[in-house]
């Protein structure tokens, strides 16, 4: 979910004290105000670790920073899951976890992480480069996506940081970040005040700027926060992808994914809906999951993911992707 | 990244009739389901109203059975709701979804802005 405030724009400073101080301080307050809601905003963050024992082990860990409830997570490899993506998991917070080879296990660590071990050998292993996503759905509100991959130098056994680095709670997080900000605009105000202290205020030449100023514009976190918390897409490489599983068919997809901010949402904010559930105790619920289509006399829908939601009758592969969007 | 509009809704009276459309487009979806769920002003999100899945199966709430229909249409890849015989309890934001089956309930993963469908007199 993306958030944009819009913060007006800096006007140079009248002579005098009002002028100089007057429209700092008057803006202050609208840029800490701004800093302060967005400093909430859900993130998502993404760590991948590969095991020292095994070389083609993957232990992939996603968590929500965020307030809302959780009522879907989609794990995927080779780009999110909507962009040519493959989905190795999904986990409803009450209704079980879905998987697929190559995942061996995806559980829920807490209400609002998971994790997911890979093992991989011959065409399904992934690679050291390969970009793992995690979507956290939070239905209707919102959805937040984030990806991950081991730096290209690191050692077996040692893992990526998380992307952003701090593991923190979501209400932990907030506290900081406007107690962060808050000092920092305290400490901008002091030496402010300073400043014109030891100097007269400059003579400033009317402003040559149309009436109409462009206004600067906030994104959720700051982009500098932004480029300091996040890890871009990292290249994919297709070849690293499974190739016993039906995948997204990519045929190259739009090429303004990578560029998005990992916190935006998919979706646009909607009535506050689900309540938060409690999550069931640890473990897979895929026999559970298997176990109800045997009840019903009829096995899983599927064994992998990417199945036609708009069936063509030429034949599975005669759509681009599962949806039958060309 | 997958887009899901939906359009068809609006003001209607006790007794009539509606049909939502939801435009499915963009790049690729690996999901096993589609439907659409609605949310009534100041209560909860509810279950799947109508639901389809990749075989085909269809899922009603027992509160639309037989009023409402849910087809899809391949070749435009479009979801429809038929609406009929709609009473003031239907009054809500109905959003199109694609997600994924669990115990043979679709969970929505990637859903529209909704429409919002009113019955009153």
């Known amino acids: 979910m993306r958030t944009e405030a819009q913060v007006p724009a800096l006007q140079p400073p009248e002579p005098g004290l009002e002028g100089a101080m007057g429209h700092r301080t008057l803006v202050l307050p609208w840029v800490l105000l701004t800093l302060c809601v967005t400093a909430g905003t859900p993130e998502v963050w993404v760590q991948v670790r590969m095991e020292a024992t095994e070389l083609s082990s993957f232990t992939i860990r996603c968590g929500f920073l965020g307030s809302g409830s959780i009522s879907l997570v989609t794990v995927s490899w080779g780009g999110p899951n909507g962009a040519g993506g493959t989905t190795l998991a999904v986990l409803h917070p009450e209704r079980g976890i879905r998987q697929w080879a190559p995942a061996r296990q995806a559980r829920w660590e807490t209400q609002s992480s998971i994790s997911l071990i890979l093992e991989g050998s011959g065409a399904s292993s992934p690679c050291a480069n390969t970009t793992f996503c995690c979507k956290f759905a939070s239905f209707p509100e919102g959805s937040w996506e984030a990806c991950g991959s081991l730096p290209p130098s690191s050692d077996p056994g040692l893992s990526a940081p998380p992307t952003p680095a701090p593991i923190l709670r979501a209400d932990l997080a907030g506290i900081l970040g406007v107690s962060g900000v808050l000092l920092f605009g305290c400490v901008y105000l002091l030496h402010l005040l300073r400043r014109h202290k030891h100097r007269p205020a400059p003579r400033l030449q009317p402003s040559r700027t149309s009436p109409q100023a462009p206004r600067a514009r906030a994104w959720a976190p700051s982009q500098a926060s932004q480029a300091a918390l996040h890890v871009p897409y990292a290249t994919i490489n297709t070849s690293c992808r499974p190739a016993t599983l039906d995948t997204a068919h990519p045929h190259g997809g739009p090429s303004w994914w990578a560029s998005l901010p990992t916190h935006a949402a998919h979706r646009p904010q909607g009535p506050a809906a689900w309540a938060s559930t409690p999550i069931p105790a640890r473990g897979s619920f895929v026999s559970v999951e298997n176990g109800l289509y045997a009840q019903a006399g009829e096995r899983p829908p599927h064994t992998g993911p990417g199945l036609t939601l708009f069936p063509d009758p030429r034949g599975p592969r005669a759509m681009e992707g599962p949806l039958g969007v060309r | 990244e997958v887009q899901l509009v939906e359009s068809g809704g609006g003001l209607v009276q006790p007794g009539g009739s509606l049909r939502l459309s939801c435009a499915a487009s963009?790049?690729?979806?690996?999901?096993?389901?589609m439907g659409w769920f609605r949310q009534a002003p100041g209560k909860g999100l509810d279950e799947g109203v109508a639901?389809?899945?990749?075989?085909?199966?269809?899922k009603y709430a027992d509160s639309v059975k037989g009023r409402f229909t849910i087809s899809r249409d391949n070749a435009k890849n479009s979801l429809y709701l038929q609406m009929n015989s709609l009473r003031a309890e239907d009054t809500a934001v109905y959003y199109c979804?694609?997600?994924?089956?669990?115990?043979?309930?679709?969970?929505?993963?990637?859903w529209g802005q909704g429409t919002q469908v009113t019955v009153s007199s």
């Open positions: 979804a694609a997600g994924w089956t669990f115990g043979g309930q679709c969970s929505p993963a990637d």
């Open positions: 639901t389809i899945d990749n075989a085909g199966r269809i």
């Open positions: 963009g790049y690729s979806y690996s999901g096993d389901c």
